[in-house]
């Protein structure tokens, strides 16, 4: 999530940032660590069967402002958190799925316990 008072126009970092990556490792990553000029992220979303899937990795500076904003997408439960304060800071991010809305019960898949 963005820090209070952080400007919306992304300013270039003076140095590269290393992030943990999982299910989202680019080709240039090594030992599940990627590099970026932008943000580290951790995201949780539902897969097609309604199971929560956690991915993490690097977001480049270009477009990261939009991607880290976590705008709700209709019919999709997803939450993303971004950070830059230290290397591998996304190890400590634990986004949670937004609560189900009533219409999701109607439109979404039926889960049996």
């Amino acid at each position: 999530k963005k820090e209070d008072g952080e400007s919306t126009a992304p300013t270039p970092r003076p140095k590269i940032l290393r992030c943990k990556c999982h299910h989202h490792c680019p080709e240039d990553s090594v030992n599940n660590i990627c590099s970026t000029d932008g943000y580290c992220f951790t995201m949780i979303e539902e897969d097609d069967s309604g199971m929560p899937v956690v991915t993490s990795g690097c977001l480049g500076l270009e477009g990261s402002d939009f991607q880290c904003r976590d705008t709700p997408i209709p019919h999709q439960r997803r939450s993303i958190e971004c950070c830059t304060e230290r290397n591998e800071c996304n190890k400590d991010l634990h986004p949670t799925l937004p609560p189900l809305k009533n219409r999701d019960f109607v439109d979404g898949p039926i889960h049996h316990k």
Epitope: P14, K15, I16, R18, P26, E27, D28, S29, V30, I33, C34, S35, T36, D37, G38, C58, G60, L61, E62, R86, N87, E88
Partner: antibody
């Protein structure tokens, strides 16, 4: 202006360890990575590893894991590289270098001689 | 590890001539951010390397405009339009896209 000060030379015996220093000035020490590079005559440049002084996060070239240990002292804006179990293969010039997305500035290098 | 192959190893030139150095990488240097982290350095005898060009084609501050860099992917070139005496030394290409970062073996620019 940016300066990275390194001792000119070190002479150590085989099997011993040595701690090379690199004192940074002219910029905010924690805002850039510090890298270490080895140069042997006729062998080109070899990247040893890097440390982020803001959180002491390190990345090493697999080849130098167990040989080199990188540390920093932010209070004195100094980076260190300890080299252990020295052999004649470790005789070389060792550079520290300021890194953002590429090496911008290099120290003058420390010539390490391993000899009995 | 990414292998950086520089050619030629030695480049004899006359002062005022154009010089061209090639650098090829064993894999693409396009980073996942879209940047290409390929850089050029000059090392004069008894000195540390100095940055000339960063990210393929950007001249570092204080570097004369007779130095230019070009290329993409795996194939890169450094050109010196009119060689001056102060340009003599060993030129290295370097990549910081893939860990471990690697360097070319160097090209020695010398007087013919």
């Amino acid at each position: 202006q940016v300066q990275l000060q390194q001792p000119g030379a070190e002479l150590v015996k085989p099997g011993a360890s040595v701690k090379l220093s690199c004192k940074a000035s002219g910029y905010t020490f924690t805002s850039y990575w510090m890298q270490w590079v080895k140069q042997r005559p006729g062998q080109g440049l070899e990247w040893i590893g890097e440390i982020d002084p803001s959180d002491s996060y390190t990345l090493y070239n697999q080849k130098f894991k167990g040989k080199a240990t990188l540390t920093v002292d932010t209070s004195s804006s100094t980076a260190y590289m300890q080299l252990s179990s020295l052999t004649s293969e470790d005789s070389a010039v060792y550079f520290c270098a300021r890194f953002g997305y590429y090496i911008e500035y290099w120290g003058q290098g420390t010539t390490l001689t391993v000899s009995s | 590890d990414v292998v950086m192959t520089q050619t030629p190893l030695s480049l004899p030139v006359s002062l005022g001539d154009q010089a061209s150095i090639s650098c090829r990488s064993s894999q693409s240097l396009v980073h996942s951010t879209g940047n290409t982290y390929l850089h050029w350095y000059l090392q004069k005898p008894g000195q540390s390397p100095k940055l000339l060009i960063y990210k393929v084609s950007n001249r570092f501050s204080g570097v004369p405009d007779r130095f230019s860099g070009s290329g993409s992917g795996t194939d890169f070139t450094l050109k010196i339009s009119r060689v001056e005496a102060e340009d003599l030394g060993v030129y290295f290409c370097s990549q910081s896209t893939h860990v471990p970062f690697t360097f070319g073996s160097g090209t020695k620019l010398e007087i013919k």
